[in-house]
Every structure is written in structure tokens, then in C-alpha cells.
Interface confidence: low
């Protein structure tokens, strides 16, 4: 339904607090380098304007679109050209091109300083002094570093962030209370950001049809008792929500997400028996809970799929009549019967089924042609099953750190042109699949592992897209969304790669490594490992293990020495020489 003033409509729907928070997130995701104070000023100006429109929807400029209003406001930033360069050219464009231009300049890896966590007392004082500014700063810092973070979900994170400080700043041991909560929020936040980045990549790079197919499969697994019409409605609404958020339309997105949660809870009897607890929660918790809800039990009496999709004489007729609907129904029926499959596997099966029908429905005897289509699924199902089995065995044998190292070596050999920080980040995350998924029983391993790997490989794809250096990465990232993981798995050592020149500086370490956290020390060692492989891509596992063991011993020895810096200088030279000899450099 059309509103005279879109900004007044959203302000009234969302309320002032959420309105201001969402506008701040939107601005910080677009202008990632702008100082906090500048953003707060812009948000306050927009909010005051929105209030005038609430009072009188016919007031001047109140009929303008949100893109026009927000874009005009962003384009008032005085330092736009010197801070953002060519992004300033967006301001010469008209809507909708101007917003598209801003979207294209979102940076997945902005050049921003690492967020350093202050002392707990310092944080608690800041929280008590000015709670509102403290929480706004959190939204700003997360949003500018994660320009595709799902905005309504970030409001949920901010609510938990506030709750943690409210509780822990009064606790006897503030640090013991607060730090684990902040660690949990940080880890969950990174995971949430990466999951949403895949949704946006799916919509932006592969289109609405790809996203809808993903949603049909996932929702059918989650709500196997819901009928196809219900799943269709949820998919349509969910697609609208994510299209809006990925497009920077955060107010509309948050409003529509709230409407969707309301609809789901009003109709839970026909959707899922698992929603009761979620639907008793307040809005932000409710939406989060629904998004994470466990799969409902499968209906007991589901008939064989073959009857409708292979044996029926009407298969080609039904397919021709409405191709996407028929394929959607196939995906729905297959997914609700297979919570044990990953979404990407289900999508590969649906693609195989589609390809078979395209070929067979044009053949002389269509039924004869597609009669064995389900046999083609067997190798597609077995490939991820075998891969997960092998990798979980390796993980159980090595533990997380060494499993990450094995993946670091594997991926550096596959795509050695990729930057070392990206290889370290991506391989560390790939390695986390072990502790995340291998503990699950067989029936839950594949959806856990392969869908998680899709999220991590998408990180590689978006980082690589910013500065493309490898044709192999580009190929795996762009050819097929659902075949990215099999594409990367199939890559062998890149024989065309010319090894990097040896640089002793890369392997020079200092006493500061001793004061690092265990995680940061691991990253230092893993960075060295990637560099070793880039210098000597044909090094064997045994050679690399020997060098890494020597390196670990060297760090341990020098961190215990009285004169640490001298130890690192002298023992470091010996280590480099020994490593060069061991690797034949």
C-alpha cells in the first residue's frame, strides 16, 4: 500500500530508537571511512526531518524516496572525494543509479584498524558515562567493517551487547563475567556476517532465482510439515527481506522482517511445531530464534518421490506447464525428506533433474530417457559424504590447529597467487569445520559441513573479487554457486605457479611474539607456513612438518630466554639456514 511519505511510514512502524539505529548502520555500511561523529550528525538530521514528516506527511520533501533522502544526505559529506575517491562520482548520478553506485563501492576488506578491546574497567566507565553513545559506537564499528551485515540482526546483537554490560559492570569480577560474553558475541557476529554475505552474493551475482531455490530447499528441510503453498509464501517474503537488506534498504528490510516473523507466529500450526518458544519472545529475539529454529519432524507417511517425478506419465506435461514451479515442488519434496543433505547438494540434485528433463522431454521416448534419473544422484550424494568422512578422520587425528595447517598447505598449493592474509583467514575458517561439525552424528554432518564451507568459500570469493589474482579462483567462484566447494576440492597443485623469491625478512621474528595470545601466535606461525609453501610449493608434508616443529621449538626457547631479542636474532638466523637446507631452497 502506497504511503504519502515513505520516511514517515518507516519511522512510525519501527519507532525512533530502531529508526536511528538502522539509519546509522546504513550510513556506516556505505561510508565506511567516515568518523563516528559525522555519522551521528547525519543520522540526527535525518531523524529530525523524519519527525517533521510524521507531523505532516505533505511537508516539503517528505514524498521523496528513502534512497533519494539518504543519498542526498550522504552526498553532503564535505570530504567525500578525498576520503573515497571515485565513489564521489556516485553523487553526480540520479536514483536509482546513485544507490547502485554506492552499493558497488562497498568494501568487504576496508582499510580500518583492528578493533582493540580496552580494559574492562575502561569499557564499563564508558558504558555508564554515556550508554547511548557507547551502543551507537558498537553499531558503527561493526557496520563499517561488515558492510553487508544483516541490519535487523545487528540490532539483536546490540541488544545482547547492552545486556552484557548492564549485567557484568555490576558483577564482583567484571572481567570473568564480561569477556566470555564479548568473545561469544564476536564469534557469533563474524559467523552471522559471513552467512549474510553469502545470501547477498547469491542475490547479486546469481540472481533472485538462485536465492529462491536456496530458500525453498532450506525452509523445506526446516518445515517439512508445511505444504508447498506455505513454503512458497515464506520464500517470496524472505527473498524480499534479503533483497532489501542486501540493497541497502534497511528500514524496509527490518519492517518486512518483523512482518514475516508476525506471520510465521500467527500461522505456526501450519508451519512447524518447533516455533512455540520462539514466538513467545520479544521481536528481535523472536526473529533470531525463528531463523535458527531446529528442523521439525518429518511427516510419517510421505510417499515415494519416484511416483510424481519419475513414474508419472505427466512429468513432461507438468514440467512444460510451469518449469520453475515443478522444479520448486521437486526441490520441496526432496528437501523435506532429506534433512541429512546439505542445501547445496539438494540444489545440485535439482539441477541434475532439470538438465535431465530439458534433454528427455524433447526426446522420442521421454519416460525411457528420464526413467533412471535418480541413479544419477548417487555419485553426487556420495562425493560430499566421502569427503566429510575423510576430513573428519583427519581432524580427529590432528586436532584443530594442525588440521588448519593441513588445509593451509592444501589451499596454498591450489591457489598460491592469493594473498597470504586471505589464505590464512580462509584456511583457518575452513579448518573450524572440524570442531563445528565432526562432533555431529552422521545425519547432521553434511548439512553442517558443506553449507558452512559454502559460507567460508564465499569469503574467499568476495575478497578475491576485490583484487583478482587467480583465474582458478575466479572460475570456481563464478561458474556455479552450488558447485563452488566441489570446484575447489577438485583443484590440484597449480603447476603454472612460479615460486616466490626467498626473503629472509618474512621469517624474521621478534620478542613481541611472546606476548601475543595463543590465537595470534598461531596466526604468525600459519603465515610463515603459507610463505614457506609459496617459496617451495613442491615441499612434502614431512619437510614442512619438520620445519614447523623446529619453528615452534625456536619460539618456545626464545620466549623463555632472559634476553629474548638476542635469542630471536641469533637463533632465528640458524633456523632460516636450517630450513633452507631442509627444503632445498
Amino acid at each position: 500500500d502506497a504511503h504519502k511519505s515513505e520516511v514517515a511510514h518507516r519511522f512510525k512502524d519501527l519507532g525512533e530508537e530502531n529508526f536511528k539505529a538502522l539509519v546509522l548502520i546504513a550510513f556506516a555500511q556505505y561510508l565506511q571511512q567516515c568518523p563516528f561523529e559525522d555519522h551521528v550528525k547525519l543520522v540526527n538530521e535525518v531523524t529530525e526531518f523524519a519527525k517533521t514528516c510524521v507531523a505532516d506527511e505533505s511537508a516539503e520533501n517528505c514524498d521523496k524516496s528513502l534512497h533519494t533522502l539518504f543519498g542526498d544526505k550522504l552526498c553532503t559529506v564535505a570530504t567525500l572525494r578525498e576520503t573515497y575517491g571515485e565513489m564521489a562520482d556516485c553523487c553526480a548520478k540520479q536514483e536509482p543509479e546513485r544507490n547502485e553506485c554506492f552499493l558497488q563501492h562497498k568494501d568487504d576488506n576496508p582499510n580500518l584498524p583492528r578493533l582493540v578491546r580496552p580494559e574492562v574497567d575502561v569499557m564499563c566507565t564508558a558504558f555508564h558515562d554515556n550508554e547511548e553513545t557507547f551502543l551507537k559506537k558498537y553499531l558503527y564499528e561493526i557496520a563499517r567493517r561488515h558492510p553487508y551485515f544483516y541490519a535487523p540482526e545487528l540490532l539483536f546483537f546490540a541488544k545482547r551487547y547492552k545486556a552484557a554490560f548492564t549485567e557484568c559492570c555490576q558483577a564482583a569480577d567484571k572481567a570473568a563475567c564480561l569477556l566470555p560474553k564479548l568473545d561469544e558475541l564476536r564469534d557469533e557476529g563474524k559467523a552471522s556476517s559471513a552467512k549474510q554475505r553469502l545470501k547477498c552474493a547469491s542475490l547479486q551475482k546469481f540472481g533472485e532465482r538462485a536465492f529462491k531455490a536456496w530458500a525453498v530447499a532450506r525452509l523445506s528441510q526446516r518445515f517439512p510439515k508445511a505444504e508447498f503453498a506455505e513454503v512458497s509464501k515464506l520464500v517470496t517474503d524472505l527473498t524480499k527481506v534479503h533483497t532489501e537488506c542486501c540493497h541497502g534498504d534497511l528500514l524496509e528490510c527490518a519492517d518486512d522482517r518483523a512482518d514475516l516473523a508476525k506471520y510465521i507466529c500467527e500461522n505456526q500450526d501450519s508451519i512447524s511445531s518447533k516455533l512455540k518458544e520462539c514466538c513467545e519472545k520479544p521481536l528481535l529475539e523472536k526473529s533470531h530464534c525463528i531463523a535458527e529454529v531446529e528442523n521439525d519432524e518429518m511427516p510419517a507417511d510421505l510417499p515415494s518421490l519416484a511416483a510424481d517425478f519419475v513414474e508419472s506419465k505427466d512429468v513432461c506435461k507438468n514440467y512444460a506447464e510451469a518449469k520453475d514451479v515443478f522444479l520448486g515442488m521437486f526441490l520441496y519434496e526432496y528437501a523435506r525428506r532429506h534433512p541429512d543433505y546439505s542445501v547445496v547438494l539438494l540444489l545440485r540434485l535439482a539441477k541434475t533433474y532439470e538438465t535431465t528433463l530439458e534433454k528427455c522431454c524433447a526426446a522420442a521416448d521421454p519416460h525411457e530417457c528420464y526413467a533412471k534419473v535418480f541413479d544419477e544422484f548417487k555419485p553426487l550424494v556420495e562425493e560430499p559424504q566421502n569427503l566429510i568422512k575423510q576430513n573428519c578422520e583427519l581432524f580427529e587425528q590432528l586436532g584443530e590447529y594442525k588440521f588448519q595447517n593441513a588445509l593451509l598447505v592444501r589451499y596454498t598449493k591450489k591457489v598460491p597467487q592469493v594473498s597470504t592474509p586471505t589464505l590464512v583467514e580462509v584456511s583457518r575458517n575452513l579448518g573450524k569445520v572440524g570442531s563445528k561439525c565432526c562432533k555431529h552424528p552422521e545425519a547432521k554432518r553434511m548439512p553442517c559441513a558443506e553449507d558452512y564451507l559454502s559460507v567460508v568459500l564465499n569469503q574467499l570469493c568476495v575478497l578475491h573479487e576485490k583484487t583478482p589474482v587467480s583465474d582458478r579462483v575466479t572460475k570456481c567462484c563464478t561458474e556455479s554457486l552450488v558447485n563452488r566447494r566441489p570446484c575447489f576440492s577438485a583443484l590440484e597443485v597449480d603447476e603454472t605457479y612460479v615460486p616466490k623469491e626467498f626473503n629472509a625478512e618474512t621469517f624474521t621474528f621478534h620478542a613481541d611474539i611472546c606476548t601475543l595470545s595463543e590465537k595470534e601466535r598461531q596466526i604468525k606461525k600459519q603465515t610463515a607456513l603459507v610463505e614457506l609453501v609459496k617459496h617451495k610449493p613442491k615441499a612434502t608434508k614431512e619437510q614442512l612438518k619438520a620445519v614447523m616443529d623446529d619453528f615452534a621449538a625456536f619460539v618456545e626457547k626464545c620466549c623463555k630466554a632472559d634476553d629474548k631479542e638476542t635469542c630471536f636474532a641469533e637463533e632465528g638466523k640458524k633456523l632460516v639456514a636450517a630450513s633452507q637446507a631442509a627444503l632445498g631452497l
Partner: nanobody, 124 residues
Framework: EVQLVESGGGVVQPGGSLRLSCAAS????????MGWFRQAPGKEREFVAA????????YYANSVKGRFTISRDNSKNTVYLQMNSLRPEDTALYYC?????????????????WGQGTLVTVSS
Amino acid sequence: EVQLVESGGGVVQPGGSLRLSCAASGGTFSTYVMGWFRQAPGKEREFVAAISQNSIHTYYANSVKGRFTISRDNSKNTVYLQMNSLRPEDTALYYCAASRFTSWYTADYEYDYWGQGTLVTVSS
């Protein structure tokens, strides 16, 4: 192509009842959302009622809630509209419609196939 044929219309007194039927052929009936719409002389077509594939969901316009009941029999490829406590303002041409992939049961543009209509006149 799905063909829809409505029947059961006629003249009835205020407070009376009618049962409309819509027989479908040419498609897999159980995969369609089915709806009833109506158009009074000189007015726009308006939503009356809809029913999802397995009869789990039914939707009604506020003006007919509590008086009209939509149902379907997938084994007979037929959808019904039971109309009770009829009023003069219910006078209209009633259309049956089928939708393959819908999210808004009440929007006529979501429906792919339409019948020719059956006339209902409520008059004393």
C-alpha cells in the same frame, strides 16, 4: 493449460444459500491454490476466498467472513464456495481462479487461470 468451469449460480432471496462449484481439468489440481473472486456491475473485481493446495489454509474477505466457506476435493478436481446468509450486496459475477506459485492469496494478479464466471443475484 488449466480449464476452469464454474456452476451453481442463480437467483436467491436475501438470507438464502447457494453452493458454487468449480471443476478443473488439464493440470495437476492438487498443486494449485484455488480462489474465488467476484465482480459486481460497474465495480472492480474483488477477492472473496482462497484455499491452499492441501486445504490447510483458507482466506476470506472481511465482507464474507463467517457467511461463506471455501473447500476443495482434490480427488474430484473441484473447489466449492458455500454461501449462506446472502445479502443484496453479494450480487455479482463469481469467478474461480487457480494459482501455481502464490504468496498473496488475495491478489488477483497472482492467479494464472480463470473461469468464465457464474452469476449470483440476491434479490427479493
